[in-house]
Structure formats: structure tokens, C-alpha cells
Interface confidence: low
């Protein structure tokens, strides 16, 4: 039988009546155009909805937008378009929502061609009131909030000026001209690239990287010959043109650009790219594109300084610069990432790592699934996950994989079971242990979301026909109940729930179509009465994460420590609640070779935990570039994995000596850096 339809499934009592009492319809008085939805703050219940409708006239496009506000998680909406003077809002800038619970919102308005500058509407009270402000420039990008201070905003203008506001957009100052890209760093620092000779495109590879730590009073040039730059965790990366040819290399800084080191990564040519796939304060995953139009590259993982890199995964699927990659951080379990590789026969296969890129394996075949036509051996195959690439290829995949930090161990994704990703209609699979084991959860493609920290999973079938049924599960996808939320089916466009998966409300968005008109409609369902009581201690059970061999006392050790979690029992139907905090107990492990990456010049042969010297480097001195000086590395081939907390046990020797020689890096050395003040 299909998942959730066997006798073992206990039904949730009287759920139809309970849900009917908690289903709220709102019909928007709008012609169907586009709709965008933003949550304002955390646990505030405030949602802003912007609907826009374009009427293409012969000479110009006439636009109309409406703004709606809810303060009860979408159950009721109020038209507040008059608060923004019925102005047409530019949807390409979206709604700029302030960080944390600042309650700040910036909307960018469309203005007529001849105006001196743009116009914004600002709110700092969760969109209860808005202030109109005329800008002294036309914005090119959405306003960017400083992560540290939501009163500080930056924006680029259409004329490549860098503009900063210190009072939440009330007053603006142009702090630099000829700017290509600007980003907030930590401590209200702004990093930006500038061009000298004409345009960002023309000067690509000859840009300068600047920094201001005082919102434009003074500046420091921290890099030259820059192609691009990026921030990840505590790392600042710059790709820098080589002196002699058109190749470029990655340089990295951990001190805001004061000193730089050349990353031990391959250089790339004009048609190639680097991409930071993921970064935290410990390390970074870097994709390096392969030469030629291959559609793949190599993933490297960094050491704790972002300088020495280990090859993590070959033939990693990543189509083009800014293209598609399936690389996914599984946020529900530490150390887990999923991505796709392009195999020799051009089929796409899913790989998973449980130890932050140390090792990659195929996903275990779900026990309740058969191998499909892609499998050579009908008894041996793997699960392959559909993610961004499948979506971009217009396969029947409505959603990317889903995981939430507070729904420990749960991963939901579309997939197929075989030797590679199949173009056939996928099913939905769930893992409750962070990707180690999988079960088919739903037949066919669905939209899905997690509520109440995993206490409820909601799904809606992906269909071209109008729908009126929602499915929900209170036991992590084992058993499903269906609820008809309206008599009149709607064309479904999306599920919306508050980010963070703590809410018990879900909004179903869609439109109704009649002979003459179509209108936006939302149904918000509150599941609070399904989960009638608060969870108690007895509703939770102890779960050891990453457990693969319970008889091993190092079982569960990943990155030097194991974690035991209190997890909701599948059989418990109760509320985790909005204040639910994941309870975990860490325990440090003794060090083994698994806690060490292979050092620069070493690699791990397949299925071996020992690091051996790269044949091409055997007998050579290992020298690399650190802070602009050449270093000599004395190593027996191992270095501790960033973030690894193991203690005791094995302890390979590693020593770095300063060779007191300048590196052959063409990058700006510290003594050449200059500063200036405004």
C-alpha cells in the first residue's frame, strides 16, 4: 500500500471539524498579476503581501500594485495601499525587510522617467505606518541593511555610485563613485570594488577592492587586479588576475583584507569560475570549475584559515557561472551536505557527506522502494535527489530539498531510485536521521513544508488541475490524513509558512478563475487544535545523531564529538510550541585519523583513512604562501578538520616554518596598501 494508507496508521481524532474551525479564507480584490509575500520579524505574525498587475499599453506599460498586511499569520489581511499613497512598487526590488526583529521595511517605488531620483517608503513599526522619502539617486539594487545596525543602509545607483544612509533611509550620502559591487562585512564595514577606466565589465580583472570601516569617512584599498570578491563566514575572498596571463587565483583574508594569503587552489581561466558553496566560521566549501564547457568542477574544503584546501568531490555538477548546482546544506543535522555529480556517461547522481565533505557516498536505497529503469542491477541502486538543477531543467519537481535546524534529522526531497536521476515523475522521500536512511513518503510530486519544529508535515499535490485538498502528517511522514479546505478548487501557486518552521499556521496561495476575471485567494489553516496539548518529557526520546554502529563506543562521533538529542516520539501528537529549543548533549570523542584532513600535498586513496603523498609532489619540499611570505610545511600528511573537537587519541605531527621569502603572488602586499580619508 502507499505510504500512510496501511492499517497501522492511527487517525487523528475529529480533525476535519478542528481544521474547519481554523481555516480562514481571504479573497484579494485584485486582478491576477504577480504576488510576493514577506514575513516581518520573527513570531510577530506580520505578513506583507504585494500584488502587482501590468497592463501593456501600446507605448508604455501601465502598472498597479496593492499592499496588504496581516498581523495574525495570514488569517486576515487589510489593504494598506493608501499608506504608500497608492504608489506602484517595483517588484524586482522586492520588500527589503530589516534584520532580526527590527520591524523595518523598505519598499522601492516606480517613478516617472524625468525624476531626479527614486522614491522609497520606509516603516520601522512592522508596516503599521510608512514614510515616503525621495532619493537623490535612482537605485540599481535593493537597499541592503547592515547586519549589525538596521539603521545603516547601502545601495548602488544606476550611475554606479555607492550611497549610504545612517538614519534608516531618511538622508543619503554618496560615499564613492564607479562602484561595481558592494557588501556589508562585520562591524558595519563595507567592502566594494571600483573601476578606473570606463565600466565594471570593461575593467573586470582590473578592479580595485576597497574597504571603509566608518561608513565612508575614510577608505583603504585592500586589493588590486580584482575580478570579483565574496564573503563567507569569517573569510574574505578575492579572485585576482595573474600577472602574465588571463588566469586568476583566489586569495583569502581573515582580517578584513589587511593581510592576504594565496589559497592553494587551482587557478582558473577566463571561461571558468570559482564559487563559495557554503561557509561558516570554521571552513569553506569552494567549487572550482573545470576548463571547457563541461558543466562540472571540483569541490575543495578549506582548513581553518581558508588557505590549504583538500579535494573533496570530483565531477561536481555546476552548470555555468551563476548557473545551477544541487549543493544543499542539510540544516537538520550537523556536517551533512547533499549534491550531484555528473558521471562519465553524463548521468547525474546524488552524493551525500556526513562529515563536512570528508567523504561522499551514494544515498542508501529506501527500503520500501524498487530500483527504476536506470538501474543495471534491480537489487542494487541508490536514491537520487532532485534539486535546483532538476527544477531548472523543468522536470516535474516543484520544490528543492527541505530541512530545518529545529526539526532535527528531518530531510524531505523529491527523488528517484536507480543508478542516476531519472526524468520520470519523481516521488517524495523523507529521512528522519539526517540522510542516512530514507523512506518513500508520498507518491508523485508535492509541495511540502514543516510546521511546529517537525511536529507536523504538510503537503499539497503538484497538479495542473485546480486543487482543494491538503495532506498532513503528525508522525514525520509515516501516516497521512487528507483535509478538504475548500469546496471550490483553486489553481495552486504556493505554500507559505513562517520561516523557522515554528509556526502551526500554513497559508495556501492560489487563484480562482472565472469566465471574466481571476483573483488571488489565500487559505490559512491553523493546526493548533490538531496538536491539542503541549508536549511533555514523556513525549521525547533520546536519539544519538550519526549513529551507524551502536556497538562502537565511537558511534555517532562526527567532527570529534557526538550529540544526543531529545526528539519527539513519532507516536506523540502534541505541540512542540513556538518556544521549543532543540535539546542536545554533546560528548567529545577521542581523535582518530578520521578527524584529520589530508594536508597540502597529500590525498586519501579511496576507502582508506591514511593520507599518502601525491606522487607528483613526492620528494619535493612543500612550500606554500601565507600572508605574503613563503612557508615550509613539515607534515606527515594530516591536519585537523576545521571545527573538529576531538581530544586525546591519535595526534599526527604538523609544523609550519617561515621561509622568510616573498611569495610569487602578484597580489597587493600589505606595504603597498594605501589609505585615504574623505
Amino acid at each position: 500500500s502507499a505510504p500512510g494508507e496501511d492499517e497501522e496508521c492511527g487517525r487523528v481524532r475529529d480533525f476535519v471539524a478542528k481544521l474547519a474551525n481554523n481555516t480562514h479564507q481571504h479573497v484579494f480584490d485584485d486582478l491576477r498579476g504577480s504576488v510576493s509575500l514577506s514575513w516581518v520579524g520573527d513570531s510577530t505574525g506580520v505578513i506583507l503581501v504585494l500584488t502587482t498587475f501590468h497592463v501593456p499599453l501600446v507605448i508604455m506599460t501601465f502598472g498597479q500594485s496593492k499592499l496588504y498586511r496581516s498581523e495574525d499569520y495570514g488569517k486576515n489581511f487589510k489593504d494598506i495601499t493608501d499608506l504608500i499613497n497608492n504608489t506602484f512598487i517595483r517588484t524586482e526590488f522586492g520588500m527589503a525587510i530589516g534584520p532580526e526583529n527590527s520591524g523595518k521595511v523598505v519598499l522601492t517605488a516606480e517613478v516617472s522617467g524625468g525624476s531626479r531620483g527614486g522614491r522609497i517608503f520606509r516603516s520601522s513599526d512592522f508596516a503599521k505606518n510608512f514614510v515616503q522619502t525621495d532619493l537623490p539617486f535612482h537605485p540599481l539594487t535593493q537597499m541592503m541593511y547592515s547586519p549589525q545596525n538596521s539603521d545603516y543602509l547601502l545601495a548602488l545607483s544606476t550611475e554606479n555610485g555607492l550611497w549610504v544612509s545612517k538614519n534608516f533611509g531618511g538622508k543619503w550620502e554618496e560615499i564613492h563613485k564607479a562602484v561595481c559591487l558592494a557588501k556589508w562585512g562585520s562591524d558595519n564595514t563595507i567592502f566594494f570594488t571600483t573601476y578606473a577606466n570606463g565600466s565594471c565589465k570593461a575593467d573586470l580583472g582590473a578592479l580595485e577592492l576597497w574597504r571603509t570601516s566608518d561608513l565612508g569617512k575614510s577608505f583603504k584599498t585592500i586589493g588590486v587586479k580584482i575580478y570579483s570578491f565574496g564573503l563567507g563566514g569569517r573569510f574574505l575572498f578575492a579572485s585576482v588576475m595573474a600577472d602574465k596571463d588571463t588566469t586568476r587565483r583566489i586569495h583569502v583574508s581573515t582580517d578584513q583584507g589587511d593581510t592576504w594569503s594565496m589559497a592553494q587552489l587551482p587557478s582558473v581561466g577566463q571561461e571558468q569560475f570559482y564559487s563559495i558553496l557554503a561557509a561558516n566560521d570554521d571552513m569553506v566549501f569552494m567549487h572550482v570549475d573545470e576548463p571547457g564547457d563541461t558543466g562540472f568542477g571540483t569541490i575543495f574544503t578549506s582548513d581553518d584559515r581558508g588557505i590549504v584546501y583538500s579535494k573533496s568531490l570530483d565531477r561536481h555538477l555546476y552548470t555555468t557561472t551563476g548557473g545551477e548546482t544541487d549543493f544543499t546544506n542539510v540544516t537538520s543535522l550537523r556536517g551533512v551536505y547533499i549534491t550531484s555529480v555528473l558521471s562519465e556517461d553524463n548521468s547525474i547522481q546524488t552524493m551525500i557527506t556526513f562529515d563536512q565533505g570528508g567523504r561522499w557516498t551514494h544515498l542508501r536505497k529506501p527500503e520500501n522502494s524498487e530500483c527504476d529503469a536506470t538501474a543495471k542491477n534491480k537489487n542494487e541502486c541508490s536514491l537520487h535527489i532532485h534539486a535546483s538543477y532538476s527544477i531548472s531543467q523543468k522536470l516535474n519537481v516543484p520544490m528543492a530539498p527541505l530541512s530545518e535546524p529545529n526539526a532535527v534529522g528531518i530531510v524531505i526531497a523529491h527523488g528517484s531510485v536507480g543508478d542516476a536521476i531519472s526524468v520520470m515523475v519523481p516521488d517524495v522521500y523523507i529521512s528522519d536521521d539526517g540522510g542516512y536512511s530514507w523512506t518513500k513518503m508520498l507518491e508523485g510530486p508535492h509541495y511540502y513544508t514543516i510546521l511546529d519544529s517537525g511536529g507536523i508535515i504538510v503537503a499539497i499535490e503538484h497538479s495542473s488541475r485546480p486543487i482543494n485538498v491538503i495532506k498532513f502528517s503528525t508522525d514525520e511522514g509515516q501516516c497521512w490524513q487528507t483535509y478538504t479546505f475548500t469546496r471550490d478548487p483553486i489553481y495552486f501557486t504556493g505554500l507559505a509558512s513562517e520561516p523557522g518552521a515554528r509556526s502551526m499556521n500554513i497559508s495556501i496561495w492560489g487563484f480562482t478563475e472565472s469566465f471574466l476575471t481571476s483573483q488571488w485567494v489565500s487559505y490559512t489553516i491553523d493546526f493548533k487544535d490538531i496538536l491539542e496539548r503541549n508536549c511533555e518529557e514523556k513525549d521525547y526520546t533520546i536519539w544519538l545523531a550519526h549513529s551507524t554502529d551502536p556497538e562502537d563506543y565511537e558511534d555517532g562521533c562526527i567532527l570529534g564529538y557526538k550529540e544526543q538529542f531529545l526528539r519527539l516520539r513519532k507516536s506523540s501528537v502534541c505541540q512542540n510550541g513556538r518556544d521549543y529549543v532543540v535539546t542536545k548533549q554533546p560528548s567529545i570523542c577521542l581523535c582518530s585519523l578520521e578527524d584529520f584532513l589530508c594536508d597540502f600535498g597529500y590525498y586519501r586513496p579511496e576507502n582508506d583513512s591514511k593520507c599518502v603523498e601525491q606522487p607528483e609532489l613526492k620528494g619535493h619540499d612543500l612550500e606554500f604562501c601565507l600572508y605574503g611570505r613563503e612557508e615550509h610545511l613539515t607534515t606527515n600528511g594530516y591536519r585537523k578538520i576545521p571545527g573538529d573537537k576531538c581530544q586525546g587519541g591519535v595526534n599526527p605531527v604538523r609544523e609550519v616554518k617561515d621561509l622568510k621569502k616573498k611569495c610569487t603572488s602578484n597580489f597587493l602586499s600589505p606595504e603597498k596598501q594605501n589609505s585615504k580619508s574623505n
Epitope: I542, L544, E551, D552, Y553, G556, K562, S587, Q647
Partner: antibody, heavy 129, light 107 residues
Framework: QVQLVQSGAEVKKPGASVKVSCKAS????????MSWVRQAPGQGLEWMGI????????SYAQKFQGRVTMTRDTSTSTVYMELSSLRSEDTAVYYC??????????????????????WGQGTTVTVSS | EIVMTQSPATLSVSPGERATLSCRAS??????LAWYQQKPGQAPRLLIY???TRATGIPARFSGSGSGTEFTLTISSLQSEDFAVYYC?????????FGGGTKVEIK
């Protein structure tokens, strides 16, 4: 050489608390867990709990839960076991023992248990009114 | 918790003879078992770990066997210093538990 030296004998009244120390030397203190085991007069060995010297995480036998607290001071390589609400049946010799296990809470343990290989000399605690 | 049962409670053996001590677990403990020797007024001493591996400095006359729920400690030829109480201990699942002990006395 590797050794565990415990604090001296204690006489306590019922309802009081006792805190026994165990100082480790001759090995890296944070590389091994420490278990506490007690033995009542003429009785067998009874495991009380375990502490991980690195993070200080603990796991206690259900019988002692709520009454026992195990702590450590990495600066002096010392672990402590405090037992509160003492009763006459707590009269026993209390041992600390170096334990290689990787247990946390009540989770699964070793494929290849190495045993409590180093023991303290024992601390006699007498509870009497 | 896992209950460890030792038998016999007392074993009377003459010096030079073979002694066989038994330990049974209420559920499988795999090979996660240790044996200890304790003499009066002394702390226990580790003899065997991993069910069958002798600890450092333990004479070859001591051997351990078994796996799962049934374990045996064998002393092939008893010496005078071997008369003591012997305990088995499991470390398969917390809490660790000891058997009640077997006293090996001189016959």
C-alpha cells in the same frame, strides 16, 4: 606512572553531603573519561556514573540521579563526586576509575570496551548519626 | 538496565587447579565486557577487556571468552595470589553494570 589519588576518609551525618576528589596524573587528563564506582561493606561493585573531562558532560545511574553531581577541574586534572542527602546505606568505599568509554547520556557504547584500567585507592565514607 | 549474573557465588579450588567462572547478561552486550579481580582492602584490578583481551601485565593463565550473553573467565592453574573476588562488568549500554561477584577460595 599513571595514577589516581583520592581524598581521605569522611564521616557524615544523615542528610548531609560529601564531596570526594580524584586527582589524575601520568596521562593526558582530557583523553579519558572517569567513572565512579562504590562498594558497600561486604557487597559488590556498583557503578554510579561517568564524566567526560573535556566538556564536563555526565551520565548518572538512575539510582543516583538527582543526588549525585560529578564535576571536573581541568587546571588541576581533578574530578569530583558529590553525593547529597546521605543515608546510612550510602556508607561505602567510593572509587574513581579511568574509563575509555564514549558514553553520553544513556546512549550506546563500545564495540571494544577497554575496561576501567586505572583505579583510585578508594575513599571510605561513613554515614552515621 | 542490563543485569549481570555471576555463578557460582563461591568457588572452592585447590592451588594448581583450573577455575572456570561464569557471567551471564540479561541481553546481548556483544564483546563489551570486562573482568576485574579484587582482593580484600584493595581497589579492583582490570584483568580482561573486550571479553577476551588480557590487560597489560596480566599473566597468561587468565583468559576470557564468550560473546553476546554468555561469558567465561578461566584461570588455568590457580596460584596463591589468585584467591580473590572476581567481577564481570558490561559496557554495552549505559548504565554500566557489574555482576554480583564470584569469590574464589582455597579448597
Amino acid at each position: 606512572q599513571v595514577q589516581l589519588v583520592q581524598s581521605g576518609a569522611e564521616v557524615k551525618k544523615p542528610g548531609a553531603s560529601v564531596k570526594v576528589s580524584c586527582k589524575a596524573s601520568g596521562y593526558t587528563f582530557t583523553s579519558r573519561y572517569m567513572s565512579w564506582v562504590r562498594q558497600a561493606p561486604g557487597q559488590g561493585l556498583e557503578w554510579m556514573g561517568i564524566i567526560n573531562p573535556v566538556g564536563g558532560s555526565t551520565s548518572y545511574a538512575q539510582k543516583f540521579q538527582g543526588r549525585v553531581t560529578m564535576t571536573r577541574d581541568t587546571s588541576t586534572s581533578t574530578v569530583y563526586m558529590e553525593l547529597s542527602s546521605l543515608r546510612s546505606e550510602d556508607t561505602a568505599v567510593y572509587y574513581c576509575a579511568r574509563d575509555p568509554s564514549g558514553i553520553a547520556l544513556a546512549g550506546p557504547a563500545s564495540r571494544y570496551y577497554l575496561g576501567m584500567d586505572v583505579w583510585g585507592q578508594g575513599t571510605t565514607v561513613t554515614v552515621s548519626s | 538496565e542490563i543485569v549481570m549474573t555471576q555463578s557460582p557465588a563461591t568457588l572452592s579450588v585447590s592451588p594448581g587447579e583450573r577455575a572456570t567462572l561464569s557471567c551471564r547478561a540479561s541481553q546481548s552486550v556483544s564483546s563489551n565486557l570486562a573482568w576485574y579481580q579484587q582482593k580484600p582492602g584493595q581497589a579492583p584490578r582490570l584483568l580482561i577487556y573486550g571479553a577476551s583481551t588480557r590487560a597489560t601485565g596480566i599473566p597468561a593463565r587468565f583468559s576470557g571468552s564468550g560473546s553476546g550473553t554468555e561469558f567465561t573467565l578461566t584461570i588455568s592453574s590457580l596460584q596463591s595470589e589468585d584467591f580473590a573476588v572476581y567481577y564481570c562488568q558490561q559496557a554495552r549500554l549505559g548504565p554500566w553494570t557489574f555482576g554480583g561477584g564470584t569469590k574464589v577460595e582455597i579448597k
